[in-house]
């Protein structure tokens, strides 16, 4: 007996061929020997049969010997055994027909769990192998489990459902709902315009939910919420901001923060969460930013930074075009009694200079100027 | 009562094109899958080409594949052949059908004939 394997909802045809040429009477049956079509004369007959509307032929193919029963939107309760009759013969052929489906949504939120859940036929033993667009294999029977999902498992996933040494694919887009970075840093000179930009991984139709970034100053001993806001179709809304500091948000993605001055106070770590409508749970961004200040106060030059640093980071003071006269993984160097001329703050890592500011030391009699 | 009313048939030559309408009525077209077949002269029907109720699936005969095209407009109630790159093999009285029985509808037929 041949044994056909089918997905649920698409379109199967199971084949039977007379040893004649031409067109002859042909009549497909069920198991329960319910006639389910055939043909008489130039037309096609339709017997009692559950599937009346979703069983078809294609009478092309009759002329040549071929009499294909095509069963379109398949279900799984349409596996059966079928029986093609022509010229006193009668031919069986096995139909298997498999679902494959996500357990809820196909959009998770980044860190939840995906569940895989195979419809099959009563009796059939089938093994499933899915393969995430990242190269991850998960085997398993009825379900098939995926705990934290990451943003490289967006993506088709592709799973194999092997039954009787045959087999049929599946192919699932998820959606990972996560933003392109989970954590961010900003560097600026003390008065710069900061701008904080927190772009999604995903593309939706309409995105709707609320949001909130959540401030903690290095200098501040608890946290503090700095703007609420709404997502409405992607259009932004702030509805609720603080007075100090007093950020700005575009009313249109990615989201956007502007933070008019950097300023020492504001250094530290953010928190951005974005709850989605409909869904459980919420995405996170970090945001971090340091502040860098130069000062020349008497005849002592201070730079300073503020701010979530890494300990291999180097605070040097050099003057312009000369070898650094100070150089420490510290948060704070200076140069007491410096010469005349432009110094440069700089703040890098490995070589990479991530901060730079320019300070002009007058001839001691003067006062600093600064650029 | 239920008529199948078939229009568009004619004298063409070799090489030339006629498209063949079929009006339906007194039942619900919507829902029938319909055929067109011919009977060349001294011959017995043919079927010709197949299409689904909503339009989306066609079949053809061999023969014709390629140069004829089934068509059906729901909201007219009509039923199409479009016949290109016509052969004097073509010529017969062309018919429109449902495709199944029940219900087994007939139309009373139109004359094509190719010819130089």
């Known amino acids: 007996k041949k044994v056909v394997l089918g997905k649920k909802g698409d379109t199967v045809e199971l084949t039977c061929t007379a040893s004649q040429k031409k067109s002859i009477q042909f009549h497909w049956k069920n198991s329960n020997q319910i006639k389910i079509l055939g043909n008489q004369g130039s037309f096609l007959t339709k017997g009692p049969s559950k599937l009346n509307d979703r069983a078809d032929s294609r009478r092309s193919l009759w002329d040549q010997g071929n009499f294909p029963l095509i069963i379109k939107n398949l279900k799984i309760e349409d596996s059966d055994t079928y029986i093609c009759e022509v010229e006193d013969q009668k031919e069986e052929v096995q139909l298997l027909v498999f679902g494959l489906t996500a357990n809820s949504d196909t959009h998770l939120l980044q860190g939840q769990s995906l569940t895989l859940t195979l419809e099959s036929p009563p009796g059939s033993s089938p093994s499933v192998q899915c393969r995430s667009p990242r190269g991850k294999n998960i085997q398993g029977g009825k379900t098939l489990s995926v705990s934290q999902l990451e943003l490289q498992d967006s993506g088709t996933w592709t799973c194999t459902v092997l039954q009787n040494q045959k087999k049929v694919e599946f192919k699932i887009d998820i959606v990972v709902l996560a933003f392109q970075k989970a954590s961010s840093i900003v560097y600026k000179k003390e008065g710069e315009q900061v701008e904080f930009s927190f772009p999604l991984a995903f593309t939706v139709e309409k995105l709707t939910g609320s949001g909130e970034l959540w401030w903690q100053a290095e200098r501040a001993s608890s946290s503090k919420s700095w703007i609420t806001f709404d997502l409405k179709n992607k259009e932004v809304s702030v509805k609720r901001v603080t007075q100090d500091p007093k950020l700005q948000m575009g009313k249109k993605l990615p989201l956007h923060l502007t933070l008019p001055q950097a300023l020492p106070q504001y250094a530290g770590s953010g928190n951005l969460t974005l709850a989605l409508e409909a869904k459980t749970g919420k995405l996170h961004q970090e945001v971090n930013l340091v502040v860098m200040r130069a000062t020349q106060l008497q005849k002592n030059l201070t730079c300073e930074v503020w701010g979530p640093t890494s300990p291999k980071l180097m605070l040097s003071l050099k003057l312009e075009n000369k070898e650094a006269k100070v150089s420490k993984r510290e948060k704070a160097v200076w140069v007491l009694n410096p010469e005349a001329g432009m110094w440069q703050c700089l703040l890098s890592d490995s070589g990479q200079v991530l901060l730079e500011s320019n300070i002009k030391v007058l001839p001691t009699w003067s006062t600093p100027v600064q650029p | 009562e239920v008529q199948l009313v078939e229009s568009g048939g004619g004298l063409v030559q070799p090489g030339g094109s006629l498209r063949l309408s079929c009006a339906a009525s007194g039942f619900t077209f919507s829902k029938l899958a319909m055929s067109w077949h011919r009977e060349p002269p001294g011959k017995g029907r043919e079927w010709l080409a197949d299409?689904?109720?909503?339009?989306?699936?066609?079949d053809y005969l061999a023969s014709v594949k390629g140069r004829f095209t089934i068509s059906r407009d729901n909201a007219k109630n009509t039923l199409y052949l479009q016949m290109d790159s016509l052969k004097s093999e073509d010529t017969g009285v062309y018919y429109c059908a449902s495709r199944e029985d029940p219900p087994g509808y007939w139309g009373q037929g139109t004359q094509v004939t190719v010819s130089s």
């Open positions: 299409i689904d109720s909503s339009g989306d699936t066609t």
